[in-house]
């Protein structure tokens, strides 16, 4: 029925599904499900019945509005949530909210893959290591973000000397959080510490 | 079975403030929402908004946007309408009055409290 | 918002008669109408819901119809205990709005 929402959360947080308008006037009866078939949750006009699910004892139904409210979610609450409303002439009517949930970033380390000077130039190859996620990189010296194309996990630059920077860091970021690492280096071109 | 009952009649000067009550009994307060609705001396009803008692957010009419303030104390089912600065024209009978379970119908209503506003 | 316009806006009328109050809408708001009496010095009591849904404890004597604009309450046999005065109200949209009310007098 087309009432579809994408939401994005971090893990551990309380969450509220709801739609963003009025309930139908007069229906029957509203339930949320997941993954289409599973019932989280029912209301008749006069009690909320929740049923056995993962979800028993994390969430609270607001009858006058709709709204579910799920408390510290996780991954694995990922899923597709339905709020179908049916309606005394017999038809319903559906919203769907489809809920990502995603933990939040760890800080990067910068490895310092190599560092060569090269006729007063330097050559600087960072990687930022964190352990396997789907994050963006953003890399900055002296916090002045470098140029999008070489923006990804490894920087691979040759920098001249009025480009020099003393600190360089990795920003890696989902929707939900960023983390920073920096490492620092002598100049022109030589380690200092992490 | 449901239940509302509204505190007693207030007397006031115009510029004082006034907080009715309306404590709710023989089903689960946070359930259904609660309207207002004030009824001028021999005139007709006139809604003047609700409160969505699971989340505690007020919505006004048009008319009682500014001195009108709806709250909830949850613990003792009790809803209230505060009224600032009041004026002679707000002299009428309050009511609070149950949202039904499905729709905007008010299936319930308090007694009613009547505010006089007189100098 | 939408207005609800009653009428008569008062009847005078005979135990055992047939009453009929009408309420129209300044816009089509599908069936949802409902209705109160109120006695006086009392607080208003929902007599009927959704246009024509009946109420538990309320007498089969009252009953609605109507769709869109324009609705009707109708007492079949009235009795003495029916004098009061009658109010719509709508649900459709925001705000809410109640009719300037009927009032029913006994002969």
């Known amino acids: 029925q087309g009432h579809l929402v994408h939401m994005t959360v971090v893990s551990g947080s309380n969450v509220t599904l709801n739609i963003s308008e009025s309930l139908p006037e007069n229906y029957k009866q509203l339930t949320w499900f997941y993954t289409f078939d599973q019932k989280i949750v029912e209301w008749d006009s006069r009690k909320s019945k929740y049923f056995e699910s993962k979800f028993k004892g994390r969430v609270r139904l607001d009858p006058q509005s709709g709204a579910l409210y799920i408390s510290k979610v996780q991954k694995e609450d990922n899923s597709t949530y339905i709020m179908r409303v049916l309606k005394k002439t017999g038809n319903e009517q559906e919203w769907k909210i489809k809920l990502q949930v995603l933990d939040p970033v760890p800080k990067p380390v910068i490895k310092i893959e190599k560092i060569e000077d090269m006729d007063d130039n330097c050559y600087l190859k960072l990687s930022c290591v964190i352990p396997g996620e789907s994050v963006n990189y953003t890399w900055y010296g002296d916090k002045r973000p470098f140029p999008k194309e070489l923006q990804n996990s490894v920087l691979e630059t040759t920098l001249m000397p009025h480009n020099y920077s003393r600190c360089y860091t990795c920003q890696v970021s989902n929707s939900v959080s960023s983390k920073n690492g920096t490492v620092c280096l002598s100049p022109p071109c030589t380690l200092a510490r992490s | 079975q449901v239940q509302l009952v509204q505190s007693g009649s207030e007397l006031k000067k115009p510029g004082a403030s006034v907080k009715v009550s309306c404590k709710a009994s023989?089903?689960?307060?946070?359930?259904?929402?609660m309207n207002w609705v004030r009824q001028a001396p021999g005139q007709g009803l006139e809604w003047m908004g609700w409160?969505?008692?699971?989340?505690?957010?007020?919505s006004y009419g048009n008319v009682f946007k500014g001195r009108f303030v709806f709250s909830l104390d949850t613990s003792v089912s009790t809803a209230y309408l505060q009224i600032s600065s009041l004026k002679a024209e707000d002299t009428a009978v309050y009511y609070c009055?149950?949202?039904?379970?499905?729709?905007?119908?008010?299936?319930?209503w308090g007694q009613g409290t009547l505010v006089t506003v007189s100098s | 918002e939408i207005v609800l316009t009653q009428s008569p806006d008062f009847q005078s009328v005979t135990p055992k008669e047939k009453v009929t109050i009408t309420c129209r809408a300044s816009?089509?708001?599908?069936?949802?109408i409902h209705w109160y009496q109120q006695k006086p010095d009392q607080s208003p009591k929902l007599l009927i819901k959704?246009?024509?849904e009946s109420i538990s404890g309320v007498p089969s004597r009252f009953s609605g119809s109507g769709s869109g604009t324009d609705f009707t309450l109708t007492i079949n046999s009235l009795e003495a205990e029916d004098a009061a005065t009658y109010y719509c109200?709508?649900?459709?949209?925001?705000?809410?709005?109640f009719g300037g009310g009927t009032k029913v007098e006994i002969k």
């Open positions: 009055a149950r949202r039904h379970g499905n729709g905007n119908v008010f299936d319930s």
């Open positions: 023989g089903y689960t307060f946070t359930d259904f929402g």
């Open positions: 409160i969505n008692t699971f989340t505690g957010e007020p």
């Open positions: 816009q089509s708001i599908g069936s949802n």
């Open positions: 959704y246009t024509s």
């Open positions: 109200q709508q649900s459709n949209s925001w705000p809410l709005t």
